[in-house]
């Protein structure tokens, strides 16, 4: 007989990702005997909270907390009962709540208080509900991607941990209300607000990150709608044959469209707006979202924001993935190069409403928005962030890695699991029959 290592006990952690359009719950698990003070964390399960994001409950904070109950009840089942008390539970809110906090801080506080009240009713170790900064959202997304793709540390076949020689991956996240770009850089950032220094597994990383508020997919669509109402009287990015009635109050309610709000407008007025399937006018409309006129640094992405040249490979997730996946899967279009991505966007923008519905049978909701979404993704990557064909070749569009959703939630969890003490591994006398 000899000492045989018993399968280590599992620990669990829960993160509620309170996005602008909806909330998702992720339950993570890892062996209690963790290596280098960071656990080998993977996704155990997930749950989509029904209804809108918590920011949509500004007028009804208790509705925000009530919406979470179904997923929290699922968590009670998914995490073993004996682990409930030791399972940390976090809620992180992103750009939807950042916007609400800008326009109505009292409502934002009320929503967070309401969800806090509900989360404390559960037997988990609740550790707070807070709004993440754009910088945190970007960095934690970068940590998630590199952790899952084993760019920090890897378990070798000889039973040793080693640091892979390949570099880290950049991360690009397109949410509903903001978008983030984060990548490792060698030189110091000219704008200190865009630089984060990280120490992971004894290694030092200098990371550039920036979050653009109001450049998430939903807010971009709303801004384009406001622009179309102002300049055209029709929507060049919507398909011909698609017509809608718009309540002006809905268009100009967001802080992201405030700048486009007419001085004297009737918020209860309804306006009819039809699509025109015009890719060139749509491209012009999307271009108007980016300003390249001034840059106080040696180089900028857009809107006067410092950005070093994009370097290395990147993973693009969330709405980047959904947009490109629609082009590839639903429309059957190639998107391997920037040129192909632009051609695919033009192709979608040329489709009429009837043609789109025939190509994507069944789906009705949001189908009219894919032209604008594709055009925005193409422009953001090429003109905004400065990807050329060579650099774009290093971008992978991914939703999951190692059966775990790519997003900021795991990185957030990883950062916080360092606070969880590891149980010593159980040793038992036994016979190893292997």
């Amino acid at each position: 007989t000899r000492d045989v290592r018993e399968p280590p006990a599992l620990k669990y952690g829960i993160v509620l990702d309170a996005g602008s359009s909806h909330t998702s719950m992720f339950i993570y698990k890892w062996p209690a005997d963790k290596e280098n003070d960071t656990g080998i964390v993977g996704q155990h399960s997930s749950c989509d909270v029904p209804g809108g994001g918590i920011s949509s409950y500004a007028d009804n904070p208790s509705g925000a907390s009530q919406s979470l109950v179904g997923c929290l009840e699922q968590a009670l089942q998914d995490v073993p009962k004996e682990r409930h008390a030791g399972t940390p539970l976090y809620l992180g809110a992103t750009a939807g709540m950042r916007l609400l906090n800008l326009t109505n801080p009292e409502a934002s506080t009320s929503v967070l208080m309401a969800v806090t009240h509900t989360l404390t009713q559960y037997p988990f170790d609740f550790r707070g509900a807070r709004i993440l900064s754009g910088q945190e959202e970007g960095v934690f997304g970068w940590v998630t991607a590199n952790y899952l793709l084993e760019n920090f540390i890897k378990y070798g076949w000889v039973g040793r941990w080693f640091r892979p020689r390949k570099g880290t991956l950049g991360a690009m996240d397109l949410g509903g209300a903001s978008t983030q770009i984060t990548f490792e850089t060698t030189s110091p950032a000219e704008d200190r607000a865009s630089e984060v220094q990280l120490h992971l597994y004894g290694q030092h990383y200098r990371v550039y990150t920036h979050s653009f508020l109001c450049y998430g997919r939903d807010q971009v669509l709303q801004r384009l709608l406001a622009s179309a109402l102002q300049t055209h009287g029709f929507h060049p990015c919507w398909p011909r044959g698609f017509s809608t009635q718009v309540l002006l109050g809905d268009v100009y309610q967001s802080p992201c469209t405030m700048a486009q709000r007419p001085q004297n407008f009737n918020s209860s007025a309804r306006v009819s707006l039809s699509g025109s399937s015009d890719p060139h006018l749509c491209r012009d409309l999307v271009s108007g979202l980016f300003s390249f006129s001034s840059c106080p640094f040696s180089r900028c992405s857009f809107n006067g924001v410092f950005q070093p040249p994009v370097a290395g490979n990147f993973v693009a997730f969330s709405a980047f993935f959904y947009t490109v996946d629609f082009l590839r899967t639903s429309m059957g279009l190639p998107v391997a190069t920037l040129q192909q991505l632009e051609a695919a966007a033009v192709n979608v923008c040329n489709q009429t409403w009837a043609q789109l519905q025939a190509r994507v049978p069944g789906q009705r909701a949001r189908l009219a928005d894919y032209c604008a979404g594709a055009m925005f993704v193409q422009q953001l990557l090429s003109r905004g962030y400065g990807f050329d064909e060579r650099a774009f070749g290093g971008v992978i569009f991914q939703k999951k890695a190692a059966d775990t959703a790519v997003g900021w939630a795991l990185g957030y969890m990883l950062n916080l699991t360092n606070l969880i003490p590891a149980d010593p591994p159980g040793l038992r006398k036994g016979t190893d029959f292997s």
Partner: antibody, heavy 129, light 111 residues
């Protein structure tokens, strides 16, 4: 005020083609809206049959696709339904209705909700020999 | 197609009572945080009338005693204090995917 009025024969023989017309007043059918046909079987719920858009595009319920045609006559501001090879199962009250996509905001993201807000009074069609 | 099941099929209430009608979809009618659910009212011999869209938004001109709630597959129409003119048949309808489908209806009757 937008108004819709259905017209057509109340009795159709099996295997024949059912033909109904909807006359729209107070709004041009080419200006906007999707012009729908919906039916209600006796004592049952509503069934969406299809529409012709302001742009003359059609969208039909797949369950009726091989039998249904919706067309329009812009000079009369009318749209019509033709349903071929009818059986007793097509006996119903037939409604025409104007629908559109309403832009609505929720959770800092807008979307489009298809609603039918103008309806005709309905006309009863019986399929019988 | 998404099947819509309403319950109860008929409901007897007195004037001033609260009435609750539920609608269950065979699959989620939500997409990216939006619920594509409408409610219609139909009086005998009349055409249906839109009451609520997007699960909870009241159509203009509809009295505030009507309210809608729910998301995913489960939705509710509530009349907080039933008035004589509310006795009618109510239908739910999803517009998340083609074809749009309606529930079988709930007949609200006087007790």
């Amino acid at each position: 005020q937008v108004q819709l009025q259905e017209s057509g024969p109340g009795l159709v023989k099996p295997s024949q083609t059912l033909s109904l017309t909807c006359t729209v007043s107070g709004y041009s059918i080419t200006s906007g809206y999707y012009w729908n046909w919906i039916r209600q079987h006796p004592g049952k719920g509503l069934e969406w049959m299809g529409y012709i858009s302001y742009d003359a595009d059609n969208n039909y319920n797949p369950s009726l696709k091989n039998r249904i045609t919706i067309s329009r006559d812009t000079s009369k501001n009318q749209f019509s339904l033709k349903l071929s090879s009818v059986t007793a199962a097509d006996t119903a009250v037939y409604y025409c209705a104007g629908g559109y996509y309403r832009y609505g905001l929720g959770s800092y993201s807008g979307s489009y909700y298809y609603v039918m807000d103008y309806w005709g009074q309905g006309t009863t069609v019986t399929v019988s020999s | 197609d998404t099947q819509m099941t309403q319950s109860p099929s008929s409901l007897s209430v007195s004037v001033g009572d609260r009435a609750t009608i539920t609608c269950k979809a065979s699959q989620s009618v939500d997409y990216e945080g939006h619920s594509y659910m409408n409610w219609y009212q139909q009086k005998p011999g009349k055409a249906p009338k839109l009451l609520i869209y997007a699960a909870s938004n009241l159509e203009s001109g509809v009295p505030s005693r009507f309210s809608g709630s729910g998301s995913g597959t489960d939705f509710t129409l509530t009349i907080s204090s039933v008035q004589p003119e509310d006795f009618a048949t109510y239908y739910c309808q999803q517009s998340n995917e083609d074809p749009p489908t309606f529930g079988g209806g709930t007949k609200l009757e006087i007790k």
